[in-house]
Interface confidence: low
């Protein structure tokens, strides 16, 4: 009897859906693996007799529950299937958005870029999938612990009347209010304000 794959899980970020597993702990031979997905009541092969311990399911529909399964094989023998259920739109991790920050006197002007979706049109982003998509922004004076958070209404935001000649750090995450779901924070971007004199328009 071939032991089944262990630690089977879906690693999904921005709808790049990678089913991952580990070779059975005490397998003393080189196993191969087959991974399948349920389509209209019939299981279809996605990765067949692969020596890898992962399989890319990014082409799955983003909506609805999917049943995936994987088994280990050796020669004419095989293990039992290990099943998992996965709903991309609910389960995928929202990766960090992009952010552009520009200093204009005592203001920080920020523009946010929703993460791109894998295996989709070049312009397709997470914002196209989630109707409620918005951003959480947090900012703080560099070197202090006190963080302030805002929820911009648009893909851009301006923090005005900041202290001049002071370094502020900003980071952003995706936020889905209707799902109460937050994404990963972007790396902080730190910029120094200049004077508080009026900037000519």
């Amino acid at each position: 009897m071939v032991p089944p794959p262990e630690n089977v899980r879906m690693n999904s970020v921005n709808f790049k859906n990678i089913l991952q597993w580990e070779s059975p702990a005490f397998a003393k031979r080189n196993l191969t693996f087959t991974a399948q997905y349920l389509s209209y009541r019939i299981f279809q092969d996605k990765c067949t007799s692969t020596t890898l311990t992962e399989c890319d399911f990014s082409s799955l529909s983003k909506y609805g529950d999917h049943t995936l399964r994987v088994r280990a094989e050796f020669a004419d023998e095989h293990s039992d299937w290990v099943n998992i259920t996965f709903c991309p739109v609910d389960d995928t991790i929202i990766g960090p958005p992009g952010m552009q920050v520009e200093v204009l006197a005592d203001s920080l002007h920020m523009r946010f870029l929703a993460p791109k979706i894998e295996n989709e049109y070049e312009t397709w982003t997470m914002k196209n999938v989630y109707n409620s998509w918005t951003y959480n922004v947090q900012y703080w004076k560099n070197g202090t612990d006190e963080k302030f958070q805002i929820t911009p209404q648009y893909d851009f935001e301006v923090l005005r009347n900041l202290e001049p000649w002071t370094t502020y750090c900003v980071q952003v995450q995706g936020f889905l209010p209707d799902r109460n779901k937050t994404g990963e924070w972007s790396e902080p971007v730190c910029e120094k304000t200049t004077s508080d004199e009026t900037v000519p328009s």
Epitope: N136, K147, F148
Partner: nanobody
């Protein structure tokens, strides 16, 4: 250190209205979110409404059970946030807390909390 003081709670009949106020002192930025959470007897604390006042206007979030009945607003000049509660129901009975950095209403992971004000709705 930010300090938050709530007021305006009380006993009201079902269908009635109350207006809660929260005055923030030591509050250093009008950009920070501020809002209201509540805790009913024997239940976990939950977010009610949260407001951010940003460089491009105001954005408010509400939990579904109060949307359309409660309105959150803020007056940055007075460092005060308000919760206008209309069409109150017995289910709204709870201690209402003011809190900063409240943007995620599903978890009471705000940074600073007031002492709370009791709201009781009788049927």
């Amino acid at each position: 250190q930010v300090q938050l003081v709530e007021s305006g709670g009380g006993l009201v009949q079902s269908g009635g209205s109350l207006r809660l106020s929260c005055v923030a002192s030591g509050f250093t930025s009008p950009y920070s979110t501020i809002g209201w959470f509540r805790q009913a007897p024997g239940k976990e604390r939950e977010g009610v409404a949260c407001i951010s006042s940003s460089g491009r206007g105001v954005n408010a979030n509400y939990i579904d059970s109060v949307r359309g009945r409660f309105t959150i607003s803020r007056d940055n000049a007075k460092n005060t946030v308000y919760l206008q509660m209309n069409k109150l129901k017995p289910d709204d009975t709870a201690i209402y807390y003011c809190a900063t950095n409240c943007w995620r209403l599903t978890s009471p992971a705000a940074d600073n909390w007031g002492q709370g004000t009791q709201v009781t709705v009788s049927s």
